[in-house]
């Protein structure tokens, strides 16, 4: 009998609000025995796979996806899914990446530390759609983000 796979979690280092040109790393976590982690973007057709999976703890594995120089186009919701033979997990919750202009003054928001989206809830009715649509991006003052329908 196939085991029930736990939903993955996703987090961002150093946080989810990143200055233009700075780096960000998405961290996807799942159980041990994961073969492939996939990082997907809501409303975008692109994705990234890695089989470079490390053991984060005795019961957890993880993979890291790094963006060296964040641009406006990187803003938006991201989520993880993993493959543990013989099947794929459900998707994680979405984690929204916000990109801020570096020209902001001292009142600019600091980078949010260690934001994450974990398996804290069962999937919504739409979660079985692995490519759920979102509206096109909105640009706030000094901040790039994509509006996400919950």
């Amino acid at each position: 009998q196939e085991e029930d796979l736990p939903r993955p979690s996703i987090s961002a280092e150093p946080g989810t609000v990143i200055p233009l040109g700075s780096h960000v790393t998405f961290v996807c976590r799942g159980p041990v025995g994961v073969q492939t982690f996939r990082l997907e973007r809501e409303s975008r057709s692109t994705y990234n796979d890695t089989e470079d999976v490390s053991q984060a703890s005795p019961s957890e594995s993880e993979a890291r996806f790094r963006i060296d120089s964040v641009s406006e186009g990187n803003a938006g919701p991201y989520r993880c899914i993993y493959y543990k033979p013989p099947k794929w997990s459900e998707q994680s919750d979405y984690l929204e990446l916000l990109v801020k202009e570096t020209s902001g003054g001292p009142d600019s928001p600091d980078t949010e530390p260690g934001s994450s989206a974990g398996p804290t809830q069962r999937p919504s009715d739409n979660s079985h759609n692995e490519h759920a649509p979102a509206s096109q991006g909105l640009k706030a003052e000094h901040l790039y983000h994509h509006h996400h329908h919950h």
């Epitope: 492939t36 409303s43 975008r44 057709s45 692109t46 994705y47 990234n48 796979d49 899914i81 493959y83 099947k87 794929w88 739409n126 759609n129 692995e130 490519h131 759920a132 649509p133 096109q136």
Partner: antibody, heavy 116, light 111 residues
């Protein structure tokens, strides 16, 4: 890497038929596979898809008429009760690495003829 | 259900010329879009996806643009080998399933 369709043949109307898309040279579990058909002298017509995560999608016209299923190396298209309008070349295709929007790998197609 | 309206149905152009093919979606599909070339007796060949990325081995004479509901394929410096039928496709899977629809095709003749 390649995909190849098989199972096409001459059948009489109402005779169930299963077409198979066989993957070689790549790990099928990572990819979406779509089925597309083309009637003689006509355009491309989408039938449905089996996604990497195991979900299936169908064109509205195909719901109830076909069933798509997958194993670790194949994706099958079962035609439950073919009619003469289902005479066509059937293609399967795999999406491109890193982007779900384009299907770069296509099989040569398999011909299905439905005739009494 | 999503409808892709492709225009024109056919077009004729001279060697060295330019052809523009348009595809309009009845709903927004973001960047979930591709263009294919098909010659008689052959399988379709991916030209453009995403919807402006050039597929491997495709010359830069082929250019895709657009997003949302309006998409364009431009073929410049036309060659005899470009004579074919061109199709647009949406591959969008979403909350309201929209994926997999093809446009009606555009037959390109080279004079």
């Amino acid at each position: 890497a390649a995909v190849k369709e098989s199972g096409g043949r001459l059948v009489t109307p109402g005779t169930p038929l299963t077409l198979t898309c066989t993957a070689s040279g790549f790990s099928l579990y990572k990819y979406n596979i779509q089925w597309v058909r083309q009637a003689p002298g006509k355009g491309l017509e989408y039938i449905g898809a089996s996604t990497y995560a195991g979900y299936t999608y169908y064109a509205s016209w195909a719901k109830g008429r076909v069933t798509i299923s997958r194993t670790s190396t194949t994706v099958d298209l079962k035609m439950t009760s073919p009619t003469t309008e289902d005479t066509a070349t059937y293609f399967c295709a795999r999406h491109i690495d890193g982007d779900y929007s384009g299907y770069a790998l296509w099989g040569p197609g398999t011909l299905v003829t439905v005739s009494s | 259900e999503l409808v892709l309206t492709q225009t024109p149905a056919s077009v004729s152009a001279a060697v060295g010329g330019t052809v523009t093919i348009k595809c309009q979606a009845s709903q927004s599909i973001g960047t979930w879009f591709a263009w294919y070339q098909q010659k008689p007796g052959q399988s379709p060949k991916l030209l453009i996806y995403g919807p402006s990325k050039l597929a491997s081995g495709v010359p830069p004479r082929f250019k895709g643009s657009g997003s949302g509901t309006e998409f364009t394929l431009t073929i410049s410096d036309l060659e005899c080998a470009d004579a074919a039928t061109y199709y647009c496709q949406s591959t969008y899977f979403g909350v309201d399933y929209l994926g997999g629809t093809f446009g009606g095709g555009t037959e390109v003749e080279i004079k």
